[in-house]
């Protein structure tokens, strides 16, 4: 990695999380340089010999790429000149977790920054009214989580109430034997109330809300990654 730049440039990374079996992004930005051919981007992973990815002279150079990343990485080439060195990662695996370094070298100088990449599985929950039950109940389902999350219920009317005694949560291993389907049933629900099902592990937190009235059922779900930024 040659050193021709006289000073350091600012390189910024963001701690992020990858959802296994999907595309992931390792985020990295730097001070832009209009001379594309003078920009070198190197991604490294702690504990791995060879590079995760290299982009230089306006194109990818995978001559030193480690085999575990072959065919799985790409930079956003059209965004490099505006200072985007982020890396797209195909088919995220648990083993992709770790500390990555984004090295940048431009005509203005050089710099680097580390990022912590977490991997796991997280998905939106869906809450439905379970009419099969003897008394009215709610069923909260989320198809893919890893590591095993905690599940908690809350209610707008009974704020602060502990629903662990009137709920039942199960974890069913999915076909790839890593992720699990989360199912939680809340019993003895009352109408004209809003219930929330919260699923959380060390990577993500998801919440599903359901409002049950005489005339309608309203649902809302949200997912947030933890410790990002």
């Amino acid at each position: 990695f040659g050193i021709s730049g006289k000073h350091f440039i600012t390189v910024t990374t963001f701690t992020s999380a990858g959802n296994i079996g999907e595309d992931g992004t390792l985020s990295c930005t730097f001070e832009p340089d209009i001379k594309l051919n003078g920009i070198v981007i190197q991604w490294l992973k702690e504990g791995i010999k060879g590079l995760v990815h290299e982009f230089k002279e306006g194109k990818d150079d995978l001559s030193q790429q480690h085999e575990m990343f072959r065919g799985r990485t790409a930079v956003f080439a059209d965004q490099v000149v505006v200072g985007n060195a982020s890396l797209r990662l195909k088919n995220v695996q648990l083993t992709d977790a770790g500390t990555y370094t984004c090295y940048i070298h431009t005509s203005k100088g050089k710099g680097n920054a580390n990022l912590e990449y977490k991997t796991g599985a997280f998905s939106m929950p869906e809450i439905n009214v379970d009419y099969n039950a003897s008394s009215e109940s709610l069923r909260c389902e989320a198809p893919r989580w890893f590591p095993q999350p905690t599940v908690a219920w809350a209610s707008q009317v009974d704020q602060g109430a502990n629903f662990s005694e009137v709920s039942n949560t199960s974890f069913e291993l999915n076909s790839e034997n890593v992720t699990m389907k989360v199912v939680s049933v809340l019993y003895n629900v009352t109408i004209n109330n809003t219930y929330s099902c919260m699923i959380e592990n060390d990577i993500a937190k998801a919440t599903g809300d359901i409002k049950v009235t005489d005339s309608e059922v309203k649902r809302r779900s949200q997912l947030e990654l933890l410790n990002s930024g």
Epitope: I20, G21, E22, D23, H53, K59, D60, D61, L62, S63, Q65, R70, G71, R72, T73, A74, A77, R88, K90, N91, R144, N174, S175, E176, T179
Partner: antibody
Framework: EVQLVQSGAEVKKPGASVKVSCKAS????????IGWVRQAPGQGLEWIGD????????NYNEKFKGRVTITRDTSTSTAYLELSSLRSEDTAVYYC??????????????WGQGTLVTVSS | DIQMTQSPSSLSASVGDRVTITCKAS??????VAWYQQKPGKAPKLLIY???TLQPGVPSRFSGSGSGRDYTLTISSLQPEDFATYYC?????????FGQGTKVEIK
């Protein structure tokens, strides 16, 4: 515009070898994987393998290992598929295709016109 | 290696019909499933990739969905030009694999 132009039809005898070429234009040849797929008459599509022209890295369908070689010539932006020890069941249309996503191996988004290889004694 | 089992192998439908084709992966989970349309004597054409992303220029009547091991191609309202053979492809694994194909014929 991305274009993949393949070599012409071939007739070969059992036991022989065939080499099909695929000339790419309209994009940076060394930056995208190129895959090979075949289709026997009246049959479905069968993935053979692929190559990253920027480094020469290859992946092969286990079924063809030992009989197939995928190479490239970066000076002419051409990829090649060579299949040896030909048998009658290798009679098929052979397609080359560019994989989307640059160095990321994506789905095949641009295809050559196909090359018919006939194996007959 | 991941195999893709596609069904049905053929179907008859009329213009305006809603058509659904499914592919089941032999193992694992990933979203790397693409769908192709092929007409006789022509090269395949990419319709959908990454389970549900429509390739530019492909009509919106084509849609893809799925998760886990089960993936679906839906044509919401079959048009005369849609009569063709459709293939799924899994491209998440190191070794790619096509489904066996589904021929959509005129009823």
């Amino acid at each position: 515009e991305v274009q993949l132009v393949q070599s012409g039809a071939e007739v070969k005898k059992p036991g022989a070898s065939v080499k099909v070429s695929c000339k790419a234009s309209g994009y940076t040849f060394t930056s995208y994987w190129i895959g090979w797929v075949r289709q026997a008459p009246g049959q479905g599509l069968e993935w053979i393998g692929d190559i990253y022209p920027g480094g020469g890295y290859t992946n092969y369908n286990e079924k063809f290992k030992g009989r197939v070689t995928i190479t490239r010539d970066t000076s002419t932006s051409t990829a090649y598929l060579e299949l040896s020890s030909l048998r009658s069941e290798d009679t098929a249309v052979y397609y080359c295709a560019r994989l989307a996503g640059s160095s990321y191996r994506g789905a095949m988004d641009s295809w050559g016109q196909g090359t018919l290889v006939t194996v007959s004694s | 290696d991941i195999q893709m089992t596609q069904s049905p192998s053929s179907l008859s439908a009329s213009v305006g019909d809603r058509v659904t084709i499914t592919c089941k992966a032999s193992q694992g989970f990933n979203k790397y499933v693409a769908w192709y349309q092929q007409k006789p004597g022509k090269a395949p054409k990419l319709l959908i990739y990454y389970t549900s992303t429509l390739q530019p220029g492909v009509p919106s009547r084509f849609s893809g969905s799925g998760s886990g091991r089960d993936y679906t191609l839906t044509i919401s309202s079959l048009q005369p030009e849609d009569f063709a053979t459709y293939y799924c492809l899994q491209y998440g694994d190191l070794l790619y694999a096509f489904g066996q194909g589904t021929k959509v014929e005129i009823k």
